[in-house]
Interface confidence: low
């Protein structure tokens, strides 16, 4: 017969899980021993594994609720293609029966005693109720039993007394205006309302109770704008480190306007948020060296030659300079301390000369003394020999410029009886007086 085939068998509940499908034979379904089958939907689920006993079911309820009874439980041989221990076929149930007792004895009814006296009326004025009671002890019930009917009964009673009128509050009056126009100030704004003990008033005879509670109440006003809070300075912060490693610097302290922060249109803190101090490292700053001006050129000479004056023989000369003022690990002067150049020596050489044009007029001398004059000159200028302007001293080092050096002896035709300099002098006109400009202002 075809069966419903499932992929899982749940041991704890004995249920089939994971329906694979129907219309297959048990033999085909149980090709996989992990599978399970049902002969019809909702029927007994049998696993495909070899048969074995299921877990025992829980005990059924005791057959009686009081005194001794008995109860059953069962297990089933579940599986396919074989038998359970005891040569039992799959599907067979095995039962167990045991004695049980939910409650040792069965309940027994009790009987009522006679009614007790009536209690006083429930009120001291006007009409109320009164109550009387009886006990379930004639006889007492056994094993959780009870008496039938009620343990107490009530009836109406009349005190023949007029009741006093107790006071009750009339409705609250309107809220008064707020005691302040903003909240957060020194006094919290409040509004107040009052009520009267007049709905009704307490009676005089017999005396009624006054109204409970207070005749007025207060509450915080809502919807008010916050009061402005003026800002206050916090403490000065730490002094910043001196920003320089030598000489004087400036350190700073800062404070914040947050003690409190200005709020709701309150003014900002008055005064400065920062203050500065001079800090003294007491360490002098480095002073960089500076070159002095170049010294005089040394005489133009050539090694191993006594003199090269007045000859077309290039020589060399040098000049030096001093690096001054370097202190406290300042930078040394950049560049060369010595300057070397190539030269032709025309020191004391007799050279043909020619007269220059007139120079421009010089300054008036003396500037503040009597009768100042100015002068101009014509000079006997030497005509330099046409030696090569560049030379190649060492092969492969290229051409080097050659400079004429020395004071030659120029020879010119006499001019106005002079051989070297002709000077013309003129008086300076309309000379102003020399006055201290500072004194002039006074």
């Amino acid at each position: 017969d075809p069966v419903l085939c499932f992929t899982q068998y749940e041991e704890s509940s004995g249920k089939c899980k994971g329906l694979l499908g129907g219309g297959v034979s048990v033999e085909d379904c149980c090709l996989n021993t992990a599978f399970a089958y049902q002969k019809r939907s909702g029927g007994l689920c049998q696993p495909c594994r070899s048969p074995r006993w299921s877990l025992w079911s829980t005990w059924a309820p005791c057959s009686v609720t009081c005194s001794e009874g008995s109860q059953l439980r069962y297990r089933r041989c579940v599986g396919w293609n074989g038998q359970c221990s005891g040569k039992v076929a799959p599907g067979t149930l095995e039962w167990q029966l045991q004695a049980c007792e939910d409650q040792q004895c069965c309940p027994e009814m009790g009987g009522w005693s006679g009614w007790g006296p009536w209690e006083p009326c429930s009120v001291t004025c006007s009409k109320g109720t009164r109550t009387r009671r009886r006990a379930c002890n004639h006889p007492a019930p056994k094993c959780g039993g009870h008496c039938p009917g009620q343990a107490q009964e009530s009836e109406a009673c009349d005190t023949q007394q007029v009741c006093p009128t107790h006071g009750a509050w009339a409705t609250w009056g309107p809220w008064t205006p707020c005691s302040a126009s903003c909240h957060g100030g020194p006094h919290e704004p409040k509004e107040t309302r009052s009520r009267k003990c007049s709905a009704p008033e307490p009676s005089q005879k017999p005396p009624g109770k006054p109204c409970p509670g207070l005749a007025y109440e207060q509450r915080r006003c809502t919807g008010l704008p916050p009061c402005p809070v003026a800002g206050g300075w916090g403490p000065w912060g730490p002094v910043s480190p001196c920003p320089v490693t030598c000489g004087l610097g400036q350190t700073m302290e800062q404070r914040t306007c947050n003690h409190p922060v200005p709020q709701h249109g309150g003014p900002f803190c008055a005064g400065d948020a920062t203050r500065t101090h001079i800090c003294n490292t007491a360490v002098p700053c480095p002073v960089d060296g500076e070159w002095d001006s170049w010294g005089e050129w040394s005489p133009c000479i050539r090694r191993n030659m006594k003199s090269i004056s007045c000859q077309e023989i290039p020589g060399q000369q040098s000049r030096g300079r001093t690096c001054r003022g370097r202190k406290f690990d300042g930078h040394r002067c950049a560049g060369q301390q010595q300057d070397i150049r190539h030269c032709y020596s025309i020191q004391h050489c007799p050279l043909k000369g020619s007269w220059s044009e007139w120079s421009t007029w010089g300054l008036c001398m003396p500037p503040c003394g009597p009768n100042p004059t100015r002068a101009r000159q014509r000079l006997c200028t030497p005509l330099l020999p046409k030696y090569p302007p560049t030379v190649s001293m060492v092969e492969g080092q290229g051409e080097k410029n050659v400079t004429f050096w020395g004071r030659p002896l120029p020879r010119c035709e006499e001019l106005q009886g002079q051989k070297l300099v002709v000077e013309e002098k003129r008086p300076c006109l309309h000379v102003p007086a020399c006055k201290d400009p500072e004194e002039e202002e006074l």
Epitope: G247, N280, A282, V283, P284, C285, V287, G325, K327, F328
Partner: nanobody, 129 residues
């Protein structure tokens, strides 16, 4: 350029006095700050006293305060160190130094040998116990 020559050193008993002089060549003596330094045997050179170009500021090492006095005479191009109440620990070679007046000032500056541009050869002072 300034050339400095110290004089006045010698041997003296503890508690005695000496006056050291330092003569400077050059016309611009009055524009230099002057200092006295000393080098005890086997120790490093240390500051003794200094005087600014005008004489308006004078600085002393703590060890000589109240006993030594520095002064200058710009007309004679000379700086002096008057040493009283001498102690054996004052034994040293005493050097005179000149500093071209700079933009720096303050005791720390004048107490540093590096601050000075020109130095004398030194004069020996020995104080016996």
């Amino acid at each position: 350029q300034v050339h400095l020559v110290e004089s006045g050193g010698g041997l003296v008993q503890a508690g005695g006095s000496l006056r050291l002089s330092c003569a400077a060549s050059g016309r611009t003596f009055s524009s230099y700050a002057m200092g006295w330094f000393r080098q005890p045997p086997g120790k490093e050179r240390e500051f003794v006293a200094a005087i600014t170009w005008s004489g308006s500021s004078i600085y002393y090492a703590d060890s000589v305060k109240g006993r030594f006095t520095i002064s200058r005479d710009n007309a004679k191009n000379t700086v002096y160190l008057q040493m009283n109440s001498l102690k054996p620990e004052d034994t040293a070679v005493y050097y005179c130094a000149a500093e071209e007046t700079s933009k720096y000032s303050g005791s720390y500056y004048y107490m540093m040998g590096d601050s000075y541009d020109y130095w004398g050869q030194g004069t020996q002072v020995t104080v016996s116990g």
